[in-house]
């Protein structure tokens, strides 16, 4: 049969609220040099215990009786504190364990998991979160907005998550958990109603140099709109702009426009040139989120300038004319030069160049008509640009460069007139 | 001296359930634990989970919850293994063994085979 | 949880040799416990908190480590030594053994 247990004092029972300290202790007698004791939680060795053994000897000889105290301290109880503790020691051959006593947390409600601040659009649903444990267990939670209950009584109503459908202005949740020890109130988290985000971000017209965009705002709740803020940035083909992306790679132009009316003009923009734009509209609580990037582009204008350095030789019934592209910006792609000549009486000769910057006429009479003056004009596909100043034709003087280009001979009809409206060509020889 | 015996071994269809049982001696039952351990054919060893006589108190591998379930007969110094729903990966043989922190005496094991 | 590496998986020895078994943790524990199995028998009881010979066993038999590394040796091996043997950890639940080292006559 086993031998009598040594232990001649156990651990008692500690049951209290989270942060409590506490000391279980127990004692033994025995014969002979004192054994260490272990503890025991759950039947695990603890081997981090915060324990304290004192030996005291019951006589003058080594192989008398001593009396061992081992004391486990509990520092600010936890959950993990919380099971069945008991001495243990080996003695000899033989273990012996103490008679268990019980470590319990008992106390208000401990939050796992509160409602955190968070911002939501106007009217969008969204759900919030609180969790409590005991012991003791049940614990009920009862949910509030603004400070008035959600619910007829604790767990009567949402528990773990409430859902809200919506709000139309910024308010205060918090949650009361309820057990047999009482009440712990939550933090209150708040929440802001933003703007909706708009709606329907479209070009309503375009110009070479502006867009003017329109859309359509999200709603607000109880606060109406301030001003709405478009962003613009130019979008090359390799700069990645996804439709959900949310910062542009580079500094973008930023507009506020006044609201209503939920419309703006986009100035100061380079011609024919990809854009992408976004729209946020404000509020007194703060901004909605972005609407998506949308892609939008400038169209081409008529180049703002005419042809630069024009120069007219006129050698006999040849005539030599060459020039540079403009200076002024072209404001699209520049699909040629139109050139006009036109002699003191005779009508005047409208021709298509192409892109060469250079050609030679072929007039006619010999080379008789006096005061012979030409003109220039770039276009683009949106039209001609301004002609130049009528150049006059000098003659040719020998020693200058003659060069040898394709002639054009000048056709006994002007096949190469076009109306005045289309090449805007208004000067007067 | 401590001595624990279990029972002897068992043939068991799939979906069927095994009781398997230990009984203590030489050893004030009711203070130490009884812990339950698998060892499959050819395997390791795997603890199922441990009865506290004294309070009837149980803790399980969580691998094993919900198929095993432990209780003691203090009047018999008996410790029980219940596992429900077997399956033929359950074919082991099943250690009690008293544990101090650690499993100072053992059983001689139970033979459960699962075959249909 | 945690997981115990033995090595070797199989160690070939003759009587009277020393052996050394190892075991690794996962994670650093506290405490580390062996096990002696023979063919046929239920686990034996060797080595207790990472030092402590269990009740009976020879002094042959001992135990050393710390952190997340431990070692079972035998400084002079009797035939009757040839065996299994496991490491067991209890620092952290669920308490967890090695897969085992075999112990065989050379």
């Known amino acids: 049969q086993a031998e009598e247990s040594p232990f001649v004092g156990n651990p008692g029972n500690i049951t209290g609220a989270r942060g409590l300290t506490g000391t279980l202790r127990c004692q033994l007698q025995v014969q002979g040099e004192p054994p260490e004791v272990h503890w025991l939680r759950d039947g695990q060795i603890l081997e981090l215990a915060d324990s304290t053994q004192t030996q005291v000897p019951l006589g003058e000889d080594e192989q008398d009786d001593w009396i061992v105290v081992s004391q486990l301290r509990i520092t600010s109880l936890q959950l993990s504190d919380t099971g069945q503790y008991q001495c243990l020691v080996f003695l000899g051959h033989q273990t012996f364990v103490s008679q268990p006593g019980y470590v319990g947390l008992e106390g208000l409600p401990y939050f796992l998991e509160e409602p955190e601040d968070r911002t939501v659009a106007a009217n969008t649903p969204f759900n919030l979160s609180c969790q409590a444990q005991g012991p003791p267990e049940p614990v009920d939670l009862l949910w509030l907005q603004d400070a008035v209950p959600l619910a007829t009584a604790p767990g009567h109503g949402p528990q773990r998550s409430l859902h809200v459908p919506g709000l139309n202005k910024t308010s205060s949740f918090s949650c009361e958990a309820h057990n047999a020890k009482g009440v712990t109130t939550s933090r209150t988290a708040t929440i802001t109603v933003l703007p909706q985000q708009p709606r329907n971000l479209h070009l309503v017209s375009r110009q070479p140099t502006e867009l003017e965009v329109a859309w359509t705002p999200g709603l607000s709740g109880i606060y109406p709109l301030t001003h709405c803020t478009l962003q613009a940035v130019l979008s090359d083909d390799g700069m990645g702009i996804q439709a959900g992306e949310p910062d542009p790679p580079e500094e973008p132009l930023t507009s506020q426009a006044s609201v209503p009316p939920h419309q703006l003009r986009l100035g100061s923009l380079h011609p024919h040139t990809p854009y992408h734009i976004r729209v946020a509209c404000t509020s007194s609580q703060g901004p909605s989120s972005w609407t998506h990037w949308l892609p939008v582009e400038t169209p081409e204008g008529v180049p703002l300038g005419p042809p630069e350095n024009i120069s007219a030789t006129r050698n006999g019934s040849q005539a030599f004319v060459h020039w540079q592209e403009p200076r002024a910006p072209l404001q699209g792609t520049l699909l040629g030069y139109r050139l006009a000549y036109q002699g003191q009486d005779t009508p005047e000769v409208l021709m298509d160049i192409g892109l060469r910057q250079e050609v030679t006429l072929e007039l006619q009479g010999d080379g008789s008509v006096s005061n012979l003056t030409v003109c220039v004009a770039a276009y683009t596909a949106a039209g001609d640009g301004p002609w130049s100043l009528p150049v006059p034709l000098e003659a040719w003087r020998p020693g200058q460069a003659q060069p040898v280009h394709q002639l054009v001979k000048e056709p006994s009809t002007p096949a190469f007139s076009w109306p005045h409206h289309h090449h805007h060509h208004h000067h007067h020889h | 001296q401590v001595q624990l015996v279990q029972s002897g071994a068992e043939v068991k269809k799939p979906g069927a359930s095994v009781k398997v049982s230990c009984k203590a001696s030489g050893y004030p039952f009711t203070d130490f634990y009884i812990n339950w351990v698998k060892q499959a054919p050819g395997q390791g060893l795997e603890w199922i989970g441990w009865?506290?006589?004294?309070?009837?108190?149980?803790k399980y591998n969580e691998k094993f919850k919900g198929r095993v379930t432990l209780t003691v007969d203090t009047s018999i110094s008996t410790a029980y293994m219940e596992l429900s729903r077997l399956r033929s990966d359950d074919t082991a043989v099943y250690y009690c063994a008293r544990s101090t922190g650690f499993f100072d005496y053992w059983g001689q094991g139970t033979l459960v085979t699962v075959s249909s | 949880e945690i997981v115990l590496t033995q090595s070797p998986a199989t160690l070939s020895l003759s009587p009277g040799e020393r052996a050394t078994l190892s075991c690794s943790a996962s994670?650093?524990?506290?405490?580390m416990y062996w096990y002696q199995q023979k063919p046929g028998q239920s686990p034996r009881s060797l080595i207790y908190l990472t030092s402590n010979l269990a009740s009976g066993i020879p002094a042959r038999f001992s135990g050393s480590g710390s952190g997340t590394d431990y070692t079972l040796t035998i400084s002079s091996l009797e035939p009757e030594d040839f065996a299994v043997y496991y490491c067991q950890q209890w620092s952290s639940n669920p308490p967890t053994f090695g897969q085992g080292t075999k112990l065989e006559i050379k």
């Open positions: 994670s650093s524990i506290g405490y």
């Open positions: 009865i506290y006589p004294g309070s009837g108190n149980t």
